[in-house]
């Protein structure tokens, strides 16, 4: 027959926190007796000093007492609290026992710390003595700082605990402790049981997954049992009462707290951490001692307890590998149709947006790389002079160019434009060579020679010429535009050496020259060059700027002239022009 694989018995255990397809599913730690082997703090234990106690038994109508010694120093005669949570062997019962006759209003308490939050299903006590006449069970959810009642037992609920007897449990009060007289009989005199089931009779127990109230109700970090009143035969006040009183005490052979380590459906076991604290071994991207929050960077949807239908695992934020931190925003989650609420923090690699899903200002997407690539965003590198801004098109990378500028980064002049030296208008239109003849104007002469003498550009500058003109300025031609019978030059006035009645200011201005003057090169002027302009005051077409004509002197600028012109300026101030 077929041979058995040597590893057959070692098949990997199925993962309780995910299904066969690897999808997350609810998982819960094993059901345990959370009290087993744990220390119980008790308010009273017999045997210190050694004391007599008597065990009552009944034979028909006859009551028998057998007396023994409780001695805390003798292991054979001691009844320590450790016996509450040791292995419960019915054939060899070990019992914790209190001091004798601690009767109401004195009480005896047993306090058990579970070490972490548990979801408690039951609390049970098996007695070696008769069961108490009145007893309360309390729970703490904050490691013993505060206590809330879990259950009361008494034949006199109102008198002992100010609670109604067997009050009905409704949806409205299912997280409240009730008082009952069940389990309060004196008999059996030994071996009696009190078992409190936390969900018994609670209306939402059938839908526990969807009842936060009951989930909270069964949660405890500590359990306390308070024995309030002993059952007696009523003989404790008779003449020979000492024997009777030595017969009344509380003795318990077994304390059990049945439940599961609380992990909210996100862990299959609890383990000891480095501090030896009990914690859930969290799965589904959860964290915390009870898997009660999402682990860092898994904040795309709110933390939720797992249910039988939904694992409600925590989901990583989608930051396209550009952020290490994110936070949850409930309103964004709702606005997304309850799909995604994570907001990425400190997007790196020049990305931006809630998911670091687009490029930040000054960068654009390199479509050849996925958005997750660390170089998915490239710098726009818009030309500092040619571009109108630093932000480029997110997909094409095209920078916004100034007039006459082209190129993806706005780094060159467009066709029909030439470079200027102005940072404001770095590219200016190349002036269309004006026609030598123009039939459009009657005034315009047939022959330029009879109209004016075209300047040869080698003119000299002297005091006489300076004095004859109304203004003298150094200009930089930036741009030329045809405007009807005029050419309008945008010029930058660099220095003013003389001005007439109309004040000429430095900076960008308009210079107007008639078309016919330009046609006959009177004056001869080219964009992007610097000139010394000497002219007479005349009204310009737009009432602003300056006018030059055939009588104006336009000479290509030489830096050596600056000093000479300053001298002319000083002489003019001293009245030398009138003499010239």
């Amino acid at each position: 027959g077929p041979g058995l694989s040597m590893f057959a018995g070692q098949a990997a255990q199925p993962d309780p926190c995910s299904d066969e397809n690897g999808h997350p599913r609810r998982c819960i730690p094993d059901f345990v007796n959370a009290a087993f082997g744990k220390d119980v703090r008790v308010s009273s234990t017999c045997g210190r000093p050694p004391a007599r106690y008597c065990v009552v038994s009944e034979r028909g109508e006859e009551r028998l007492r057998s007396c023994h010694l409780c001695n805390a120093s003798d292991p054979k005669k001691a009844h320590p609290p450790a016996f509450l949570t040791d292995l419960n062997n019915p054939h060899n019962l070990t019992c914790w026992q209190s001091e004798n006759y601690l009767q109401f209003p004195h009480n005896v308490t047993l306090t058990l710390s579970l070490g972490k939050k548990f979801e408690v299903t039951y609390v049970s006590l098996q007695f070696c003595s008769p069961r108490p006449e009145s007893m309360a069970i309390y729970k703490s959810m904050d490691y013993g700082r505060t206590w809330v009642p879990f259950q009361f037992y008494s034949t006199q609920c109102r008198k002992m605990y100010n609670r109604p007897h067997r009050a009905p449990i409704t949806k409205q009060n299912e997280q409240e402790a009730v008082c009952t007289d069940s389990h309060t009989d004196m008999r059996p005199l030994s071996g009696g049981l009190i078992a409190f089931s936390t969900l018994d009779g609670r209306p939402s127990a059938h839908d526990f997954d969807n009842s936060p109230v009951l989930q909270d109700w069964v949660t405890a970090t500590d359990i306390r049992v308070a024995f309030s009143r002993l059952h007696t035969f009523g003989d404790e006040n008779e003449d020979d009462s000492e024997l009777a009183r030595d017969s009344y005490f509380y003795a318990v052979s077994d304390l059990q707290v049945g439940g599961r380590c609380k992990c909210n459906g996100h862990a299959a076991r609890c383990v000891r951490d480095r501090d030896d604290s009990l914690v859930c071994d969290c799965r589904h991207n959860t964290a915390g001692p009870e898997c009660d929050r999402c682990k860092p960077f898994h904040y795309d949807r709110p933390w939720q307890r797992a249910t039988a239908r939904e694992a409600n695992e925590c989901v990583a934020c989608n930051c396209n590998l550009h952020a290490r931190r994110c936070r949850f925003n409930m309103e964004l989650y709702k606005l997304s149709g309850r799909k995604s609420g994570g907001v990425c923090l400190n997007c790196r690699h020049n990305t931006a947006g809630r998911h670091c899903h687009y490029c930040k200002e000054g960068y654009y997407r390199d479509m050849g790389k996925p958005i997750t690539h660390r170089k998915a965003c490239k710098a726009c590198d818009c030309h500092p002079v040619g571009a109108a801004g630093k932000t480029c098109n997110q997909t094409t990378g095209q920078c916004p160019c100034k007039d006459g500028v082209t190129g993806i980064t706005c780094n060159r002049c467009a066709k029909g434009y030439q470079q200027s030296r102005s940072p404001i208008a770095p590219c200016i239109k190349i002036p269309v060579a004006p026609p030598t003849t123009a039939a459009s104007s009657v005034e315009e002469p047939e022959d330029c020679d009879s109209y004016c003498k075209a300047s040869k550009g080698k003119l000299k500058i002297n005091m006489k010429k300076y004095c004859k003109k109304d203004y003298a300025v150094q200009i930089h031609i930036l741009k030329a535009d045809k405007a009807g019978d005029w050419w309008k030059f945008t010029v930058n006035i660099i220095s003013v050496y003389k001005q007439g009645t109309s004040r000429i200011r430095r900076g960008d201005q308009s210079l107007w020259i008639r078309s016919r003057d330009i046609a006959c090169k009177c004056p001869k002027i080219k964009p992007l060059k610097k000139y010394l302009l000497l002219g007479n005051a005349e009204d310009s077409p737009d009432q602003s700027g300056i006018v030059a004509d055939k009588s104006s002197l336009v000479i290509q600028w030489r830096d050596t002239w600056a000093r000479r012109l300053r001298k002319f300026q000083q002489r003019e101030k001293k009245g030398k022009c009138k003499k010239a």
Epitope: E331, S336, G337, A352, G353
Partner: antibody, heavy 109, light 101 residues
Framework: QVQLQQSGPGLVKPSQTLSLTCAIS????????MHWVRQATGQGLEWMGA????????SYNQKFKGRLTISKDTSKNQVVLTMTNMDPVDTATYYC?????????WGQG | DIQMTQSPSSLSASVGDRVTITCKAS??????VAWYLQKPGQSPQLLIY???NRYTGVPSRFSGSGSGTDFTFTISSLEAEDAATYYC?????????FGQG
């Protein structure tokens, strides 16, 4: 204290674009979503959309998708509603409202 | 979209009366419901959020309850100044929707 101050034209012509501004003060602008809600005369309230000023993410009521844009200017602590192709049926009071646990703060409309 | 249906559409009551308004959601909205009051010519005012939490400064006579699909808004003892239009609103899932008032 928290204030939401609205500004914009009282009237726009049909087919024109409505532009309303909501200027905030009294809290950290980027920490709360800003919503726009409108109310036709004598009618109920209608949620239009919202923006998260922290990063400019928006969410719109499908009814207005394509016509509605909500934007922010963090430097001015302002949120702007722009709605194109206005029609007489869009006649309403437009409110900006701060999100969070319910709309605790509203503009004057 | 989630519909929020308010009832009654209008009601008259006297000072001191206990007044209840209900709001029914077309699907479960957990407890993501708010209640507002609006007086003529004024912006709405938040009274209750998360179905039952009274907003800061709101008088204790106003209360809210419910979860899932059925919600109730109560004024325990009506005062003259309470005359207004009341709206419920869900913010469970986009688009946010209001009751008709």
């Amino acid at each position: 204290q928290v204030q939401l101050q609205q500004s914009g034209p009282g009237l726009v012509k049909p087919s024109q674009t409505l532009s309303l501004t909501c200027a905030i003060s009294g809290y950290t602008f980027t920490s709360y979503n800003m919503h726009w809600v409108r109310q036709a005369t004598g009618q109920g309230l209608e949620w239009m959309g919202a923006i998260y000023p922290g990063n400019g993410d928006t969410s719109y009521n499908q009814k207005f998708k394509g016509r509605l844009t909500i934007s922010k200017d963090t430097s001015k602590n302002q949120v702007v509603l722009t709605m194109t192709n206005m029609d007489p049926v869009d006649t309403a009071t437009y409110y900006c409202a701060r999100g969070g646990t319910g709309f605790a703060y509203w503009g004057q409309g | 979209d989630i519909q929020m249906t308010q009832s009654p559409s209008s009601l008259s009551a006297s000072v001191g009366d206990r007044v209840t308004i209900t709001c029914k959601a077309s699907q479960s909205v957990s407890n993501d419901v708010a209640w507002y009051l609006q007086k003529p010519g004024q912006s709405p005012q938040l009274l209750i959020y998360y179905a039952s939490n009274r907003y800061t400064g709101v008088p204790s006579r106003f209360s809210g309850s419910g979860s899932g699909t059925d919600f109730t808004f109560t004024i325990s003892s009506l005062e003259a100044e309470d005359a207004a239009t009341y709206y419920c609103q869900q913010d469970y899932s986009s688009p946010w929707t209001f009751g008709q008032g």
